[in-house]
């Protein structure tokens, strides 16, 4: 079926940066100044995407491909195809409603986008904190308390004693 | 077609006042969080205040509180923000913003933007 349709469809012959014109008897024309078409076989194109005001240009609009916005510096992109921009905060701070906050102690934030998140728990894994997290960092873990203990070494430990009821083999 | 159309900056004196207005159309305006949001020259886009559908959360920036009050008239689809007070630092293009789909629950991102009016505080 796709090949037929092909065959009977003149316009499956456009490339992508034209449409198939109806008026000029189904011709591929070149999409026309801030247009374009990103795929072949299209009818029209498509307008290009104008990045003003806060959004500034990243990408130019071309015959085949849309224009890419992004977002004036103090905030960054969000959303598909940078529809929205969201407001940056300092390390160490998350967004709020009600602007740019601080992280609660025992989370962090290591970038200017995000919600603070919960230092580690080391003791979870049996090991010990070697740095303090602060606001901005977390936590580092290091070796389990028991191999920071004095007089430990690396000696394998003895066997455990056979239980009780079993003769030697 | 969805827009936002600031007015009512200009040239005042330190100390003075003046009335930003920013007026909606194309989108049911009293379902949307607004914003103010600045640009000072040379410096960062910086986030001012918002406001919720109803009026009862309003939110500043640490440097304006006390100074800036921001209102809004959903019967005239229009955003306002009273700034008293001014300083040479409160120099900058002042746009309103809509708070996008979802504002304040998942995300604070603003996806429709005036052009911005220029307010500029000198003696």
């Known amino acids: 079926f796709e090949r037929t349709r092909s065959l009977q469809d003149p316009c499956s012959n456009c490339p992508a940066g034209t449409f198939c014109d109806n008026n000029r008897n189904q011709i591929c024309s070149p999409c026309p100044p801030n247009s374009f078409s990103s795929a072949g076989g299209q009818r029209t194109c498509d307008i290009c995407r104008q990045c003003k005001g806060v959004f500034r240009t990243r990408k130019e609009c071309s015959s085949t491909s849309n224009a890419e916005c992004d977002c004036t510096p103090g905030f960054h992109c969000l959303g598909a195809g940078c529809s929205m921009c969201e407001q940056d905060c300092k390390q160490g701070q998350e967004l709020t409603k009600k602007g740019c906050k601080d992280c609660c102690f025992g989370t962090f934030n290591d970038q200017k986008r995000g919600i603070c998140r919960p230092w580690t728990n080391c003791s979870l894994d049996g090991k010990s904190v070697l740095v303090n997290g602060t606001k901005e960092r977390d936590v580092v873990c290091g070796p389990s308390p028991a191999d920071l203990s004095p007089g430990a070494s690396s000696v394998t430990p003895p066997a455990p004693a056979r239980e009780p009821g079993h003769s030697p083999q | 077609e969805v827009q936002l159309v600031e007015s009512g900056g200009g040239l005042v004196q330190p100390g003075g006042s003046l009335r930003l207005s920013c007026v909606a159309s194309?989108?049911?305006?009293?379902?949307?969080?607004m914003n103010w949001v600045r640009q000072a020259p040379g410096k960062e886009l910086e986030w001012v205040a918002n406001?919720?559908?109803?009026?009862?959360?309003?939110y500043y920036v640490d440097s304006v509180k006390g100074r800036f009050t921001i209102s809004r008239d959903n019967a005239k689809n229009s955003l306002f923000l009273q700034m008293n007070s001014l300083r040479a630092d409160d120099t900058a293009v002042y746009y309103c913003?809509?708070?996008?789909f979802g504002y304040g629950d998942s995300h604070f991102g603003m996806d429709v933007w005036g052009q911005g009016t220029t307010v500029t505080v000198s003696s």
């Open positions: 913003a809509r708070g996008g």
């Open positions: 194309g989108f049911n305006f009293s379902n949307y969080w």
């Open positions: 406001i919720n559908q109803d009026e009862s959360e309003k």
